[in-house]
Amino acid sequence: DSSKWVFEHPETLYAWEGACVWIPCTYRALDGDLESFILFHNPEYNKNTSKFDGTRLYESTKDGKVPSEQKRVQFLGDKNKNCTLSIHPVHLNDSGQLGLRMESKTEKWMERIHLNVSERPFPPHIQLPPEIQESQEVTLTCLLNFSCYGYPIQLQWLLEGVPMRQAAVTSTSLTIKSVFTRSELKFSPQWSHHGKIVTCQLQDADGKFLSNDTVQLNVKHTPKLEIKVTPSDAIVREGDSVTMTCEVSSSNPEYTTVSWLKDGTSLKKQNTFTLNLREVTKDQSGKYCCQVSNDVGPGRSEEVFLQVQYAPEPSTVQILHSPAVEGSQVEFLCMSLANPLPTNYTWYHNGKEMQGRTEEKVHIPKILPWHAGTYSCVAENILGTGQRGPGAELDVQYPPKKVTTVIQNPMPIREGDTVTLSCNYNSSNPSVTRYEWKPHGAWEEPSLGVLKIQNVGWDNTTIACAACNSWCSWASPVALNVQYAPRDVRVRKIKPLSEIHSGNSVSLQCDFSSSHPKEVQFFWEKNGRLLGKESQLNFDSISPEDAGSYSCWVNNSIGQTASKAWTLEVLYAPRRLRVSMSPGDQVMEGKSATLTCESDANPPVSHYTWFDWNNQSLPYHSQKLRLEPVKVQHSGAYWCQGTNSVGKGRSPLSTLTVYYSPETIGRR
């Protein structure tokens, strides 16, 4: 049943004498395993015997025995799937039909495979794309319908007989579908490759030549041109003639049109291979080329730079940068059209030649205000000297210079005066737009160049101003030197350190915190009476009479300032004690008599003691001793003693006389 056998393998296999052939093959015998396999060469069916006749190249039987002469041919298959075969070496007479006779337990099949063995290695085949254009990458393919595991080969590419540098990718196929060896080469042809021979060479493993295929490259490209100019250096002077010739060195396909370009722009009515320029002007300087087109596109020649030489034109000056800030760097560039380029320059600042400046550029590393002005230049080349152009203006900007704060008032300034200050400067660019003053008020305010300080304070020490344009320049501060009367005048006791006792040595100091001017005079005063003119008031031995209200005055040329009144207190023991009697020193018995201990003391007497004529202390301690009713026996001499924190004092004796009343005399 033929439908039960399915085979897959290449229809024809190619090889050459001495090589080998590898036949990839698969099959399916659906009724069971293969029991017998015979490989015939050119098999023919014999109807009489119902068998195939032909040369048996290989035979395998149930017992697996293979004749020894069959080693050249190998069956590499199995009993149910694989029917791969190898013939190594293969011979010319192996060409023809190979028959695979397969038998299973119940079925038989003959499968035919064509084998083409040539006498010599057959050439590979080069495949090219339909069109090749310059600089466009193409893939060249070299294909050989041969591959065998036992016979390694290689394909090499050559251009004009020289191996090509580009790396080729070789691939092989040994499958039931196809058997081949292929080499692919990626290649970007240039116009110069047009007409060149490309070879794919078949070599054995040792690099020995076996066969090859060649093709001639047809590289489509734009016209390749050469331009020739007379004179050859393309340097002329105004009025000379110039001839340019365009030659086509290669074009594929043939060219169709010709044109000339100057600086990339087409020249009208110039459609021949020769360009004649008569009596050239400097405007005709530029880059010339010819352009020839074909179906691929336009081709351009190299550019010829035609230089029409002329003397420098009037120059202009370019400044980098104006306005310039003082201290910055500035570059001046002299621009003058000339051919050849100027070799020498003359520079002018405000019409005066700048010595030693002969270059196209002038660089000033540190600009100063005096550099401002007009800069012009003159350019010179071998054909002559140009004219001086209009020049360029350099504006040098800088902060205000020499800023000073000036006091407008007549000196000296006195406390409370209105002071006027002005902010002056020498120069400024750009102009001064505002001023600042130090110290600032709490609310910064716009200020003119004049500052009025009304009711100037005594401590208004220094003032500074700034004149401002884009920058502020501060003046050195000026001292107002405000003059004022002595301040904070006060009396200070230097000694003694503790309270003043009568008899102490006492020194009072007249202090003040500040005075301007510093030269001062002192005055001491007590109760409107001048006491002294020194800073100190000294008492060698203070007495209670010195106590009182003292003031000191400090004078300078601006005015005088008095201290607050200072009370001088002298402490002394009770003194000038005396006993006064009321109503008198003679009192009638029965009446009332009051004895008072009068004294002068500081602090006041705190304690009194009374004594009688026997110096007996009486049990009375107040300032007044009251006798009521007074008796005759109270008559006698009394004295008192006063005590304070400083000491004690006693009075002299005072005699009290108590006389009898008329009643007592009457009773006697």
């Epitope: 110290p439 600032h440 709490a442 609310w443 304070g457």
Partner: antibody, heavy 114, light 110 residues
Framework: EVQLVESGGGLVKPGGSLRLSCVAS????????MNWVRQAPGKGLEWVGR??????????DYAAPVKGRFTISRDDSKNTMYLQMNSLKTEDTGVYYC???????WGQGTTVTV | SYVLTQPPSASGTPGQRVTISCSGS????????VYWYQQLPGTAPKLLIY???QRPSGVPDRFSGSKSGTSASLAISGLRSEDEADYYC???????????FGGGTKLTVL
């Protein structure tokens, strides 16, 4: 007599906007640099910003906490300074005073509650 | 926080002398004038002292200002009950390019 009168205060939600005005009289307004100062409830005084006179450039300067949110402008023809307050925050609450630096006169203030 | 530093409170009895201090730095008090403002309850601040120690007309001579280095002080002598108010110092600040204030001192007349 120099006089400044603020207006435009009120209640606004956080993120909202308000525009205060300060009308001046009794001095040459166009020459003066004008200031805004604010006072949070129970707190001290804080400078908000100022605008210079047109002759001094007419530019405005601002304290850091309000920069980018508040804009001071002036209309010399109306003797008026404005404070445009955007993206208001709760900490912007307070009394806003306008001051002329020239005479150090303060307005009566206008209250802003955020 | 305020750029200039003042004590939060001060007090005194009628007739007494009270001093309020204000401390700053070289960029404000150290190089610029000091101003003092009085703010009575519910009113706008009023200028009391300008240019360190100058009094505007109408301000009693009981109020005096002084400055030394980076500090300033306001002295009120003969204290009166109507002096009870908040007192603020102010100065221009060169670094901030604007005026700066102290946190204020609440003066109580006992």
């Amino acid at each position: 007599e120099v006089q400044l009168v603020e207006s435009g205060g009120g209640l606004v939600k956080p993120g909202g906007s308000l525009r205060l005005s300060c009308v001046a009289s009794g001095f040459t307004f166009s020459n003066a640099w004008m200031n805004w100062v604010r006072q949070a409830p129970g707190k001290g005084l804080e400078w908000v910003g100022r605008i210079k006179s047109k002759t001094d450039g007419g530019t405005a300067d601002y304290a850091a906490p309000v920069k980018g949110r508040f804009t001071i402008s002036r209309d010399d023809s109306k003797n008026t300074m404005y404070l445009q307050m955007n993206s208001l925050k709760t900490e912007d609450t307070g009394v806003y005073y306008c001051i002329t630096g020239a005479t150090d006169v303060w307005g009566q203030g206008t209250t802003v509650t955020v | 926080s305020y750029v200039l530093t003042q004590p939060p409170s001060a007090s005194g009895t009628p007739g007494q002398r009270v001093t309020i201090s204000c401390s700053g730095s070289s960029s404000n008090i150290g190089s610029n004038y000091v101003y003092w403002y009085q703010q009575l309850p519910g009113t706008a601040p009023k200028l009391l002292i300008y240019r360190n120690n100058q009094r505007p007309s109408g301000v009693p001579d009981r109020f005096s200002g002084s400055k030394s280095g980076t500090s300033a002080s306001l002295a009120i002598s003969g204290l009166r009950s109507e002096d009870e108010a908040d007192y603020y110092c102010a100065a221009w600040d060169d670094s901030l390019s604007g005026p700066v204030f102290g946190g204020g001192t609440k003066l109580t007349v006992l």
